[in-house]
């Protein structure tokens, strides 16, 4: 298959990845589906440098990222190892808070107004960021 060598229209290139920043809000799962239909994934933050880049583009607005613990342990949507990877939680977060009255705890991670991360109810309609890597195969094999 072919490889993507430049970013799609309306996406921003940075360090061999392409980023798309929403201006509307969706629940985490719907944002996740949206990115997948763009042949991308919710943003996976792997360094302080990438954190600053994303933070610069989203501003002081709650924004979903590709990190969740809906099945137990915290996991990045692209398989990046959580335990050994970059983290930027707010103090005392994640706390899986149950006091919001919406049922259940908090299983999805988002950037807060200062860029640090918080876990929140996955149904909240936050903005989101999609990411796709350049130079990865962007095409299924041709149909026979």
């Amino acid at each position: 298959g072919s490889e993507r060598t430049c970013c799609p229209v309306n996406w921003v290139e940075h360090e061999r990845s392409c980023y798309w920043f929403s201006r509307s809000g969706k629940a985490w799962a719907d944002a996740d589906n949206y990115c997948r239909l763009e042949d991308a994934h919710l943003v996976v933050v792997t360094s302080w440098e990438e954190q600053k880049f994303v933070q610069h583009h989203i501003g002081p607005v709650n924004t979903w990222m590709g990190l969740h613990d809906q099945n137990g342990p915290w996991k990045w949507v692209d398989g990046t190892d959580y335990e050994t990877g970059f983290k930027n939680w707010r103090p005392e977060q994640p706390d899986d808070w149950y006091g919001h009255g919406l049922g259940g705890g908090e299983d999805c991670a988002h950037f807060t107004d200062d860029g640090r991360w918080n876990d929140d109810v996955c149904q909240r309609p936050y903005r989101w960021v999609c990411e796709t890597e350049l130079d990865k195969a962007s095409q299924e094999p041709p149909l026979l």
């Epitope: 799609p8 229209v9 309306n10 929403s22 201006r23 509307s24 809000g25 969706k26 629940a27 719907d30 589906n33 949206y34 997948r36 239909l37 763009e38 042949d39 309609p125 962007s138 095409q139 299924e140």
Partner: antibody, heavy 120, light 108 residues
């Protein structure tokens, strides 16, 4: 101009298979997700399936999951819907439509449709 | 899944009438709401996207409003070519993308 043309419809017996095609022209087909939407005679619109621009992600309505497969060949600017184990309730006009996305998304344009009739 | 309910299911109107069609979502969909027009034997055509944005080429007599769960499509002065069926559709929680059952606008 942007155009979508469906083909492959016809009369088929229950339990049999059919493959629909949708030929696209007038736009960069490989840059857009694509949908199939159907409309039973005298009824409303029902979303069937969607495929991402590169074909790596696909979603289906519960009513067709496990029986229908959406695929695409970007080198031929063509979208497909493979329909297996067809049932009488699959009788409908099947439309392909381009997925236009900007955070919000909608269906535009639509093909003219192809009629599938499942009957013994 | 989010259910979309249109009312009325059908209506009769005369040329020049002001026509209003409503669409209600089973839960909040913010402004993720589109409208389509379908004439008999033809494919649907995008009319309005994101509640109130008119698709290119759509006459200004068509307008959309609303937010959250309640939305309205208005035709300010019905023309002969407007007799058709109109569908609302949500894209907030998708898949699945869901449509209203349609509103048929007939000539009185």
């Amino acid at each position: 101009q942007v155009q979508l043309v469906e083909s492959g419809g016809g009369v088929v017996q229950p339990g049999r298979s059919l493959r629909l095609s949708c030929a696209a022209s007038g736009f960069t087909f490989s840059s857009y997700g694509m949908h199939w939407v159907r409309q039973a005679p005298g009824k409303g619109l029902e979303w069937v399936a969607v495929i991402s621009s590169a074909g790596s992600n696909k979603y289906y309505a519960d009513s067709v999951k496990g029986r229908f497969t959406i695929s695409r060949d970007n080198s031929k600017n063509t979208l497909y819907l493979q329909m297996n184990s067809l049932r009488a309730e699959d009788t409908a006009v099947y439309y392909c439509a381009r997925r236009y996305s900007s955070g919000w998304d909608w269906f535009d344009p639509w093909g003219q449709g192809t009629l599938v009739t499942v009957s013994s | 899944d989010i259910q979309m309910t249109q009312s009325p299911s059908s209506l009769c109107a005369s040329v020049g009438d002001r026509v209003t069609i409503t669409c209600r979502a089973s839960r909040n969909i913010s402004n993720y709401l589109n409208w389509y027009q379908q004439k008999p034997g033809k494919a649907p055509k995008l009319l309005i996207y994101v509640v109130s944005s008119l698709q290119s080429g759509v006459p200004s007599r068509f307008s959309g409003s609303g937010s959250g769960t309640d939305f309205t499509l208005t035709i300010s002065s019905l023309q002969p070519e407007d007799f058709a069926t109109y569908y609302c559709q949500q894209s907030y929680s998708s898949p699945p993308w869901t449509f209203g059952q349609g509103t048929k606008v007939d000539i009185r």
